[in-house]
Interface confidence: low
């Protein structure tokens, strides 16, 4: 059962796992949600009736029955983890805490103009978990305007105390606001020989990398595969750090793989969601339950539905035994990972999918695409929307992309002459324009947010957000596309598609069926040569064939240039402008979305 409200002056008795310090009950709830075992918590607020050493303590708790006895206690605030809830969860915390000093290892001290600058510094520093900033009113003259960057083993403060004229806050890495590079490569036959901060068991290097990504201290990792010569180290995932933030020594070793934390691009990759099945693999751990199940998929469902289950092993039925049902072993451990991994015993293992909701919805795999052909099939581009205007008559105006459950990203030039959002309708999950009838459901537009530097498409800033009046329920036919990570600026995308209902040639009409075209990206230098009379800026991105023939055209504006990278689709461009359509040596020009990620997040994450 999902309980979101906090219980004032209430303490849960017993079930303690560990105590951490958090600046608020709300953040205590987030910490509990991300902890592998925590189901309930009790937070102690500052209060004259309470011992100051207990202020800001957040006690994480577990219970077999998923609840604990309640006791009245002034200043105590209790609640439940969001693990039991089905809604999206985020660790992003933009709150600034006035007159609180969050204690940790102060590893960097510098002057900053404001708390915001200090927070940005923390967000762009690989080691920083949180910061404290002494304002201009801080009594001690030499500490005024000092920004202290801090880290701890757990990512949460070691203590929190009241201190006048300081403010504290957390790194915004988990808000996708970091400018740190995102190194996605996994290096085969490589061991990083730096200090280990932790080790866990993992079935493959990808799971090891995801564990590293959401471990507060892990910057890179080394994984020993099941062929690793030393048996006791097989499937071992070593979580590592270094002072510089990079591995100091790389050793060539067969059957080992190494890679980096993907913290700065975690909003566009799955981090918590380990959805694969591992055949002929047994996960060992504390047994929660043994249930009969028809298949390993059914076993995964059972694990996902049992809130305390973290991973499972399924042993298929012996012929004609137990109505063809096998045994499903639901398991857990102190850190969410198996205590040991064994091979060759016939089991099929995997993880709960309960934590997938902690990842961005946009990372979910979508159905395989139909290769070839220009007409799309249903569900092929589930983020693509058709934006209609109802004035003077209803018609398709522009394309757009779902980037959040209340947000569509499109082009600013679409709104020339649009006086009010009231005349706009957003249709999602549409393949054919002919599906749209009077009674077809649509999303009304609450607000049009046009980039304030936009003047005309050719001069850039051709980007706009539509805030919908109601939220989109994600399904196979309507779901978001990931924004590119700022750390991915140097990625070379090779699998890019432009989609829309636009014209197929310059003098044409809107197409009925959503069209698609695979188009290569063109460097900005090359693009600039083709558009001598324009300035192609770094905020634009170009795509097209030298010989022409495939391109976006009138009516495609605002729609996506979608590129697949590491199995995840990213919104790399927004269809903006071009000279004619599909002309030889005239690539299409798109708004370069990665350059506007800050703007998008600022507008969409505003409280």
């Amino acid at each position: 059962e999902c309980v979101t409200q906090l219980l004032k002056d209430t303490c849960f008795e017993g079930g303690d796992i560990t105590t951490v310090f958090t600046p608020s009950a709300k953040y205590c709830q987030v910490v509990c949600t991300y902890h592998p075992r925590c189901l309930l918590f009790t937070f102690t607020a500052e209060s004259p009736s309470e011992d100051p050493t207990r202020w800001f303590t957040c006690v994480l708790k577990d219970s077999v029955t998923e609840t604990l006895p309640r006791v009245n206690r002034t200043a105590a605030i209790s609640g439940y983890s969001f693990k039991q809830c089905s809604h999206q969860i985020s660790a992003c915390n933009k709150d600034i805490y006035v007159d609180l000093d969050m204690k940790g290892i102060n590893y960097n001290s510098s002057v900053a103009k404001s708390a915001q600058e200090c927070q940005e510094r923390c967000t762009d520093d690989v080691h920083c978990h949180f910061f404290t900033y002494a304002t201009r009113q801080f009594p001690s003259l030499e500490h005024r305007n000092i920004c202290l960057l801090k880290h701890t083993q757990t990512g949460t403060p070691t203590r929190i105390t009241k201190l006048d004229k300081v403010v504290s806050g957390f790194s915004l890495k988990s808000c996708a606001l970091s400018n740190l590079a995102c190194i996605r490569d996994i290096f085969p036959n490589t061991v990083f020989a730096d200090s280990n901060i932790d080790s866990v068991m993992a079935p493959d290097a990808f799971v090891c990398g995801r564990i590293c990504t959401h471990h507060p201290g892990c910057l890179f990792f080394t994984f020993f595969s099941q062929e690793w010569p030393k048996e006791s180290q097989r499937n071992l995932c070593l979580l590592k750090t270094s002072e510089s933030g990079l591995p100091s020594t790389r050793i060539k070793k067969s059957k080992a793989l190494s890679g980096f934390s993907l913290q700065s691009c975690r909003h566009s990759i799955p981090v918590f969601c380990h959805s694969s099945f591992y055949h002929d693999t047994d996960f060992l751990g504390e047994e929660l339950d043994i249930v009969a199940a028809k298949s390993h998929e059914a076993c995964q469902k059972l694990c996902t539905n049992a809130v305390r289950c973290q991973f499972f092993t399924y042993t298929p039925a012996q012929a004609s035994c137990n109505e063809g049902k096998g045994k499903c072993y639901l398991k857990l451990s102190s850190n969410g990972s198996p205590t040991k991994i064994l091979h060759g015993r016939g089991g099929i293992s995997g993880y709960t999918l309960r934590l997938c909701k902690m990842d961005n919805e946009c990372t979910t795999k979508i159905k395989p695409r139909i290769v070839g052909g220009t007409a799309s099939v249903r569900g092929e581009w589930p983020w693509q929307v058709t934006l209609h205007t109802t004035s003077p008559t209803q018609r398709h105006l522009c394309g757009g992309s779902i980037i959040g459950n209340q947000w569509i990203l499109t082009a600013a030039h679409c709104f020339y002459g649009v006086e009010s959002p009231k005349i706009l309708r957003v249709y999602s999950g549409i393949l054919n324009q002919s599906e749209i009838k009077e009674d077809t459901s649509f999303f009304g537009v609450q607000e049009i947010i046009i980039h304030d530097q936009y003047k005309m498409a050719e001069s850039g800033y051709d980007i706009a957000l539509l805030k919908l009046e109601t939220t989109v329920n994600y399904t196979d036919s309507q779901r978001p596309i990931c924004l590119p990570s700022k750390g991915d600026r140097n990625v070379i995308y090779t699998d890019c598609w432009v989609t829309g209902w636009g014209y197929r040639k310059l003098r044409d009409k809107i197409q009925n069926t959503l069209q698609k075209a695979k188009i290569p990206l063109v460097t900005n230098e090359e693009c600039q040569k083709r558009y001598r009379g324009h300035k192609i800026t770094h905020k634009m991105i170009c795509a097209g064939y030298r010989e022409g023939g495939k391109d976006a055209c009138k009516g495609d504006s605002g729609g996506p240039l979608s590129c697949k990278h590491n199995e995840v689709w990213h919104l790399v461009g927004i269809t903006s402008w071009g000279e004619g359509c599909a002309q030889r040596e005239r690539p299409g020009v798109y708004t370069n979305v990665v350059e506007y990620v800050d703007w998008i997040l600022e507008k969409t994450q505003a409280v």
Epitope: I96, V98, K113, S114, A115, Q116, T135, R136, Q137, V167, D452, D598, W599, E602
Partner: nanobody, 123 residues
Framework: QVQLVESGGGSVQAGGSLRLSCAAS????????MGWFRQAPGKEREGVAV??????HYADSVKGRFTISQDNSKNTVYLQMNSLRAEDTAVYYC??????????????????WGQGTLVTVSS
């Protein structure tokens, strides 16, 4: 460049209410500090209310009657003025800054100022 535009001023009877708004444009993040100042004819400009990183501060003369609030998503600050008195008559200015205030809540260290909106309270 940053622009602050006030609105909501006007004439009101003593005891009445007004709500002033100040919208900031040209700056992408929310300001650390936003505030309202006023200048009555022939007097110096004085601080009325300030909101700094979410905490609010008021001049003694308006405490309990005026409320300052901020909408970070729109970079807008509001001043709800209740139980207005004749002595509240003034031009009300909105101010904003990215830096912290410098020791006195109502020091004139703000970088950005609006053009002002006139509030007239008749008894």
């Amino acid at each position: 460049q940053v622009q602050l535009v006030e609105s909501g001023g006007g004439s009101v009877q003593a005891g009445g209410s007004l709500r002033l708004s100040c919208a900031a444009s040209g700056y992408t993040y929310s300001f650390n500090s936003m505030g309202w100042f006023r200048q009555a004819p022939g007097k110096e400009r004085e601080g009325v209310a300030v909101i700094y990183l979410g905490s609010t501060h008021y001049a003694d003369s308006v405490k309990g009657r005026f409320t300052i609030s901020q909408d970070n998503s729109k970079n807008t600050v509001y001043l709800q003025m209740n139980s207005l008195r004749a002595e509240d008559t003034a031009v009300y200015y909105c101010a904003a800054d990215l830096l912290e205030y410098d020791g006195t809540w109502f020091g004139s260290t703000y970088n950005y100022w609006g053009q002002g909106t006139l509030v007239t309270v008749s008894s």
